[in-house]
Amino acid sequence: KLLQVSTIAMQQQEKLIQQERALLNFTEWKRSCALQMKYCQAFMQNSLSSAHNSSPCPNNWIQNRESCYYVSEIWSIWHTSQENCLKEGSTLLQIESKEEMDFITGSLRKIKGSYDYWVGLSQDGHSGRWLWQDGSSPSPGLLPAERSQSANQVCGYVKSNSLLSSNCSTWKYFICEKYALRSSV
């Protein structure tokens, strides 16, 4: 009799283990589905906002000529700002001309007013040269107005209609830039 009870108990325990395993598999499958769903939504959002509307820029981005710009609503240090832009398939803003600078500062005035916004400009610690993130040099009229008195790495930011410099570890808004989609029509 005792042996019989023991056998039943073991069988029940085995059944319980199998059910736990099944539940674990189901939970994993559910998590996987949720992740896939998240990717699909992000992908669809990206595709639809630009392709479906045949808009050259995603929603909440501003267009000027061949570029799309995103003005952040969060603060971060310069390096994190760069990574945030990369997540969006963009890089920190690279200002190529006075016309582009005027467009950016004009847009910022309309959107947010006089705040600090990181751009993709940093100062080489050894040579002291200012370089954009792709390695190119800024045109003479687009060099930061003041040299930051910082022992740390120095990065460029836009405020009002000026390009200034600051310790890269300070928190600021940032501006991302990506190429606008060309119309296939």
Partner: nanobody, 115 residues
Framework: QVQLQESGGGLVQAGGSLRLSCAAS????????MGWYRQAPGKQRELVAA???????TYADSVKGRFTISRDNAKNTVYLQMDSLKPEDTAVYYC?????????WGQGTQVTVSS
Amino acid sequence: QVQLQESGGGLVQAGGSLRLSCAASGSIFSINSMGWYRQAPGKQRELVAAITNGGRTTYADSVKGRFTISRDNAKNTVYLQMDSLKPEDTAVYYCKGFSLTDDYWGQGTQVTVSS
């Protein structure tokens, strides 16, 4: 999920060159940019170079003019051409995929530059 596999690391003399490759597979449609990071012993992982799907590039100050990042969309592969290597470039180099929802990392490849 996205899988990233690095290759091309090794031992090279100062002044020499190496080309790292990172092959991506899986749900790669979710990736918007690809980058290379490095981590030297006792130091933080730092961004070396990155390239967006649109082809925009970004480089760390310390590698500008020496390293070049590129991509082959047909092969789903990103490359890091490293020239004029210095002993301070010695580190484990990691490939990273940037997406809106997640970040994906490769296992890393060791690069050692001897003087």
